[in-house]
């Protein structure tokens, strides 16, 4: 199934003019994501059942090895490039989590809904970051990495990788909201 965010090799060919207050909109989207991240994390680990709720440090710790770095003290351009990479990584990861949860927890509709809503905001954020990079800094291409593919993992690994990713998401989104 298609992932919610499929970034293209950007060529700075923006079809529509960028939003007037682009940076404000980016800040608003980051604040929105930060405001709902903890609730999403709780909803996720609760839906997985035991042993997850009682082993959060071990099973849901934010130790995601290949996660793109972020340096809060960089220039706006450098921070936007790093934000772009992070949003692409989170978007594909969230797509994998959503796909897995529809199979593993088909009746957890509130979790599915929150995952989809988060993916929607990330999609909008990605569009805005790209617009800013193209219009102000003429950056048309950013090398990206994608979240881990969970398709071939067993049930426990699917759940654990999802929990770790959402633990990392909760942590990084607070940093990003602060940095912009």
């Amino acid at each position: 199934s298609p992932l919610p965010i499929t970034p293209v090799n950007a060529t700075c060919a923006i079809r529509h003019p960028c939003h007037n207050n682009l940076m404000n909109q980016i800040r608003s989207q980051l604040a929105q994501l930060n405001g709902s991240a903890n609730a999403l994390f709780i909803l996720y680990y609760t839906a997985q059942g035991e042993p997850f709720p009682n082993n959060l440090d071990k099973l849901c710790g934010p130790n995601v090895t290949d996660f793109p770095p972020f340096h809060a003290n960089g220039t706006e351009k450098a921070k936007l490039v790093e934000l772009y990479r992070i949003v692409v990584y989170l978007g594909t990861s969230l797509g994998n989590i959503t796909r897995d949860q529809k199979i593993l927890n088909p009746s957890a509709l509130s979790l599915h809904s929150k995952l989809n809503a988060t993916a929607d905001i990330l999609r909008g954020l990605l569009s805005n970051v790209l617009c800013r990079l193209c219009s102000k800094y003429h950056v048309g291409h950013v090398d990206v990495t994608y979240g881990p593919d969970t398709s071939g993992k067993d049930v426990f690994q699917k759940k654990k990788l999802g929990c770790q990713l959402l633990g990392k998401y909760k942590q990084i989104i607070a940093v990003l909201a602060q940095a912009f």
Epitope: S151, G152, V155, F156, Q157
Partner: antibody, heavy 118, light 106 residues
Framework: SLEESGGDLVKPEGSLTLTCTAS?????????ICWVRQAPGKGLEWIAC????????TYYATWAKGRFTISKTSSTTVTLQMTSLTAADTATYFC????????????WGPGTLVTVSS | TPDMTQTPASMEVAVGGTVTIKCQAS??????LSWYQQKPGQRPKLLMY???TLASGVSSRFKGSGSGTQFTLTISGVECADAATYYC????????????FGGGTE
């Protein structure tokens, strides 16, 4: 359906490769092929599984690591390479298929007999 | 890593009676437990998956229950055709596992 082949009489310390072939279908991306064995008069013993999609994730029983290797060799075949065989490896070897999330085996081959003896 | 313990190892039952087979996991496997029937010289046949869902074409005389670590397979109105070995199997975690199957009940 699934069918195993390659079962044979082999000498101790010898090697053997078993093949699991899908008939009437090709492996879809969301599919696992696993190997399970059964020694004469004994229970079912899981050996290994492979995800036949792009990532090719593999899972092995702790005792099988190093001596057994599971591989996808085509869109319809998966092999199990076995080395340093002993009499304890004498068994009927089954291949089994599992759909995502791979928690149960809904398709089984008839099995192929491997005998390790001098 | 979950280990599966199945009891009893063997049992006899009169035709028309009820059989109860238990399967215990050494740690939680949620509801990812399946049951198989195997007759001599044949391949295993899936009976039940996700603890209580009957596989296609399987008689409703077979009933599965349980979650977490304790699971049960019940066969009511036993027929001669039910004479077989029954195995439970956990499908929750395949990493660092000795065997996903229980020892079997004959």
């Amino acid at each position: 359906s699934l069918e195993e082949s390659g079962g044979d009489l082999v000498k101790p310390e010898g090697s053997l490769t078993l093949t699991c072939t899908a008939s009437g279908f090709s492996f879809s991306t969301d599919y696992w092929i696993c190997w399970v064995r059964q020694a004469p008069g004994k229970g079912l013993e899981w050996i290994a599984c492979i995800y036949v999609g792009t990532s090719g994730d593999t899972y092995y029983a702790t005792w099988a690591k190093g001596r057994f290797t599971i591989s996808k060799t085509s869109s319809t075949t998966v092999t199990l390479q076995m080395t340093s065989l002993t009499a304890a490896d004498t068994a009927t070897y089954f291949c089994a298929g599992a759909d995502n999330p791979y928690d149960y085996f809904n398709l089984w081959g008839p099995g192929t007999l491997v005998t390790v003896s001098s | 890593t979950p280990d599966m313990t199945q009891t009893p190892a063997s049992m006899e039952v009169a035709v028309g009676g009820t059989v109860t087979i238990k399967c215990q996991a050494s740690e939680t496997i949620s509801g990812y437990l399946s049951w198989y029937q195997q007759k001599p010289g044949q391949r295993p046949k899936l009976l039940m998956y996700r603890a209580s869902t009957l596989a296609s074409g399987v008689s409703s005389r077979f009933k599965g229950s349980g979650s977490g670590t304790q699971f049960t397979l019940t066969i009511s109105g036993v027929e001669c055709a039910d004479a077989a070995t029954y195995y439970c199997q956990q499908g929750y975690s395949y990493s660092d596992t000795d065997n996903v199957f229980g020892g079997g009940t004959e």
